[in-house]
């Protein structure tokens, strides 16, 4: 008789999830010499241990601590690029501007980027049928807790001037319910971070509005200022310039350092 299985509202675990995580880990440690010491089998075991046999609505940050420990990585704290609702462009930027880092340029972020996973209570099976949706089911699911944990740690590590890329084409340019707005903003350390500089990316070719005057940007400025961190906002009008550089990565002069 087939065992009854919980139906969640979100998509199930990404197919070939274990193989994907392991392959990504091997690839990352080959490309990044400072992470060559990492044992990818141990990383996978720690990742698996965070959610396998556990109720997928009852995951805690503590569950991920063994993985966090294995994935400990030092990135230059003054070269951090946060983003909200504009992931692809942020990644194109750091692909060219190699000395800046998004969370997904770190080992743990790279492992989990665009993947979904969850298990089931009291069974060692991975659920490939469905996983909890953050809104419809529960917020303490394996994916949400993972990103909350790594995002918090990433923000806590930042120093000096921290940049955040925001999507000027969205109705809420700054959304306090996003990972940036709910986690990263509140975990920047005022004793280490001097300034948060927001880059508001414009979509339209002829767009010449000053989106730094948007009410949601004023809200972000207020939150940041109350935390004793200076705030700066810049309108960025030609995102196609990132793509032109990505198409020619061999051009070493295609960086902001001149």
């Amino acid at each position: 008789v087939p065992r009854w299985r919980q139906q969640w509202s979100g998509p199930g675990t990404t197919k070939r999830f274990p193989e994907t995580v392991l392959a990504r880990c091997v690839k990352y440690t080959e490309i990044h010499p400072e992470m060559r010491h990492v044992d990818c089998q141990s990383v996978w075991d720690a990742f698996k241990g965070a959610f396998i046999s556990k109720h997928p609505c009852n995951i805690t940050e503590e569950d991920y601590q063994p993985l966090m420990k294995l994935g400990t990585q030092t990135v230059p704290c003054n070269k951090i690029l946060l983003w909200s609702r504009i992931k692809d462009l942020a990644h194109q930027f750091t692909q060219v501007q190699r000395d800046m880092f998004t969370l997904e340029d770190t080992l743990l972020g790279y492992l989990a980027d665009d993947l979904t996973w969850c298990g089931e209570f009291n069974t060692s099976k991975i659920n490939y049928q469905s996983c909890p949706d953050w809104r419809k089911d529960c917020s303490n699911n394996p994916v949400s807790v993972f990103w909350k944990t790594v995002s918090r740690r990433f923000a806590e590590a930042a120093c000096d001037v921290v940049h955040v890329m925001l999507n000027g084409s969205r109705s809420k340019i700054f959304d306090k319910n996003s990972t940036f707005g709910s986690v990263e903003v509140h975990n920047l350390q005022p004793e280490k971070v001097q300034t948060l500089e927001a880059w508001v990316i414009h979509g339209g070719r002829e767009d010449s509005r000053d989106l730094c005057q948007d009410p949601t940007i004023k809200e972000l400025e207020s939150i940041i200022s109350k935390r004793n961190i200076q705030f700066s906002c810049k309108n960025i009008y030609r995102p196609d310039k990132f793509l032109q550089c990505v198409k020619n990565p061999e051009d070493s002069s295609c960086t902001s350092e001149i």
């Epitope: 930027f93 060219v96 501007q97 880059w199 414009h202 070719r205 002829e206 767009d207 010449s208 509005r209 000053d210 730094c212 005057q213 700066s232 906002c233 810049k234 309108n235 960025i236 009008y237 030609r238 196609d240 310039k241 990132f242 032109q244 550089c245 198409k247 020619n248 061999e250 051009d251 002069s253 295609c254 960086t255 902001s256 001149i258």
Partner: antibody
Framework: QVQLVESGGGLVQPGGSLRLSCAAS????????MNWVRQAPGKGLEWVSG????????YYADSVKGRFTISRDNSKNTLYLQMNSLRAEDTAVYYC?????????????WGQGTLVTVSS | DIELTQPPSVSVAPGQTARISCSGD??????VYWYQQKPGQAPVLVIY???KRPSGIPERFSGSNSGNTATLTISGTQAEDEADYYC??????????FGGGTKVEIK
């Protein structure tokens, strides 16, 4: 090293046409926005026109819109400015300038300029 | 369109500090660039992105941008710094603007 060399300037009568060229070397030409900036004798700098690397996007100052056309040939590493219906106030040194990459929109490198004189 | 306003001239004694202002509405929301131009020569970028110095530009050149005003500061001015200086910004579309220029004279 980056080099920009303008050519095609000269004396032209009002209402006439001229085509300026800018030969680029020392960088991946197609990765960058390119621009024309001019400077009338004894005056300040005025941006004239810009073009994206691919080259789908073109931009013009109001003072030249409808009269000037910017274009580029990435296979020849060359930037062009076709100037029609020229007026006396178009008299200036015309500079070709390479844009900064990524989030910056300023001019990292300039050519030495070519003089355009519009006079009868 | 934003308009950038610069003083026509700034006079400074050798070794002293020259400050050139560039003002425009909400200028802090846009990156500002500074160019040096000597007679008969093409402009040279001395500051980009408000405060960054291109390689080869002496450390005595610095920039800042807050409120409605960007400032180019030349500390310990030298005779070779005598030139015209232009600020520039970009406010989207076809709105790429220069200030009117400031002549720096070393007394």
């Amino acid at each position: 090293q980056v080099q920009l060399v303008e050519s095609g300037g000269g004396l032209v009568q009002p209402g006439g046409s001229l085509r300026l060229s800018c030969a680029a070397s020392g960088f991946t030409f197609s990765s960058y926005y390119m621009n024309w900036v001019r400077q009338a004798p004894g005056k300040g700098l005025e941006w004239v026109s810009g073009i994206s690397g691919d080259p789908s996007n073109t931009y013009y100052a109001d003072s030249v819109k409808g009269r000037f056309t910017i274009s580029r040939d990435n296979s020849k590493n060359t930037l062009y400015l076709q100037m029609n219906s020229l007026r006396a106030e178009d008299t200036a040194v015309y500079y070709c300038a390479r844009d900064l990459p990524l989030v910056y929109t300023g001019f990292a490198y300039w050519g030495q300029g070519t003089l355009v004189t519009v006079s009868s | 369109d934003i308009e950038l306003t610069q003083p026509p001239s700034v006079s400074v004694a050798p070794g002293q500090t020259a400050r050139i202002s560039c003002s425009g509405d909400n200028l802090r929301h846009y990156y500002v660039y500074w160019y040096q131009q000597k007679p008969g020569q093409a402009p040279v970028l001395v500051i980009y992105g408000d405060s960054k110095r291109p390689s080869g530009i002496p450390e005595r050149f610095s920039g800042s941008n807050s409120g409605n005003t960007a400032t180019l500061t030349i500390s310990g001015t030298q005779a070779e710094d005598e030139a015209d200086y232009y600020c520039q910004t970009y406010t989207g579309g076809a709105s790429l603007v220069f200030g009117g220029g400031t002549k720096v004279e070393i007394k």
